[in-house]
């Protein structure tokens, strides 16, 4: 599937649209809202009943080069006594984001959009239990 | 920008950094991953900090549909199925990159945009302070 063109009847393609070769699109990678700072809750990854750690992955052929991935610290969840309760499960919560991949073919370079699945944190769930005969 | 390793045999005219504007293939790699979190898992219902998913649609953006999580309760669900208000349901937020049509309504011209989305909720034990 390709990126959908604006096919809605209430949209008219403006005259000001830049010319783009067939099968490709123009992408400005100067990020909108690049400098907005988010006020994330302090230390939720440590205070959660399903705590997690962060790992930074780095790839120079990807834009952005740094992507942060979370990993659940435990299989179970942390109970009120601070002990792991394995009757509950710590599970990852994931979200898709877009990155630009730079590809080298000989001396030519091409760019490809890529969907990346990022693990953003963990949550504690009640497992679905099946008794196998 | 980002420094890119080059084939040493290539001409030196190539910029080491990502250029400000690039032409990219219309096909997106890994595009078939499931974008509806309701279909991918039922964690939003089974979590001790359950959440509802709200559809956010914007035809000037790709992807045009993004699902936003809102925690169902202030507290967390305990073993008896009741809300325990000594614990907190807290949204897990993530900055993601999307495409914004620029100029508006143009079919094949985009700019990257960073947006903050709530992906799900997690149960947190707060540190308690008694205010004098």
């Amino acid at each position: 599937r390709k990126i959908p063109k604006v096919g809605h009847t209430f949209f008219q393609k403006p005259e000001s649209c830049p010319p783009v070769p067939g099968g490709s699109m123009k992408l400005d990678i100067g990020i909108i809202n690049e400098n907005q700072r988010v006020s994330m809750s302090r230390n939720i990854e440590s205070r959660s009943t399903s705590p997690w750690n962060y790992t930074v992955t780095w790839d120079p052929n990807r834009y952005p080069s740094e992507v942060v991935q979370a990993q659940c610290r435990n299989l179970g969840c942390i109970n009120a006594q601070g002990k792991e309760d394995i009757s509950m499960n710590s599970v990852p919560i994931q979200q898709e984001t877009l990155v630009v991949r730079r590809k080298h073919q000989g001396c030519s370079v091409s760019f490809q959009l890529e969907k990346v699945l990022v693990t953003v944190g963990c949550t504690c769930v009640t497992p679905v239990i099946h008794h196998v005969q | 920008g980002i420094t890119i390793p080059r084939n040493p045999g290539c001409p030196n005219s190539e910029d080491k950094n990502f250029p400000r504007t690039v032409m990219v293939n219309l096909n997106i790699h890994n595009r078939n991953t499931n974008t509806n979190p309701k279909r991918s898992s039922d964690y939003y219902n089974r979590s001790t900090s359950p959440w509802n998913l709200h559809r956010n649609e914007d035809p000037e953006r790709y992807p045009s549909v993004i699902w936003e999580a809102k925690c169902r309760h202030l507290g967390c669900i305990n073993a008896d199925g009741n809300v325990d208000y000594h614990m907190n349901s807290v949204p897990i937020q993530q900055e993601i990159l999307v495409l914004r049509r620029e100029p508006p309504h143009c079919p094949n011209s985009f700019r990257l945009e960073k947006i903050l989305v709530s992906v799900g909720c997690t149960c947190v034990t707060p540190i308690v302070h008694h205010v004098a």
């Epitope: 006020s39 | 907190n88 707060p126």
Partner: nanobody
Framework: EVQLVESGGGSVQAGDSLRLSCAAS????????FGWFRQTPGKEREFVAG????????EYANSVKGRFTISRDNAKNTVDLQMDSLKPEDTAVYYC?????????WGQGTQVTVSS
């Protein structure tokens, strides 16, 4: 440091109304939710009502639903609890709670007495 100032407690007759207020001040903080617990002698503190700061979503204990209304003023960092149709069993010390997700602040409490 965070300060919480509670006001509005007192003694009333059953069926009467009372309005509690709580104002938060101090360092810059990002509020998760703001609300009220209550406690009677020999019992645990119980949740009464809370309001989420981001979207004004409210939650109430079953015992006060339909009688108590919680509201907020974003600009002033205040939360009010309008208590109508009060009952003797609402007699308790009411504590204001400011929740910042990973840190929670409790006020000193204000006495509410409802006599029959």
């Amino acid at each position: 440091e965070v300060q919480l100032v509670e006001s509005g407690g007192g003694s009333v007759q059953a069926g009467d109304s009372l309005r509690l207020s709580c104002a938060a001040s101090g360092r810059a903080f990002s509020i998760n939710w703001f609300g009220w617990f209550r406690q009677t002698p020999g019992k645990e503190r119980e949740f009464v009502a809370g309001i989420r700061w981001s979207d004004a979503y409210t939650e109430y204990a079953n015992s006060v639903k339909g009688r108590f209304t919680i509201s907020r003023d974003n600009a002033k960092n205040t939360v009010d609890l309008q208590m109508d149709s009060l009952k003797p069993e609402d007699t308790a010390v009411y504590y204001c709670v400011l929740d910042l997700s990973t840190v929670r602040y409790w006020g000193q409490g204000t006495q509410v007495t409802v006599s029959s």
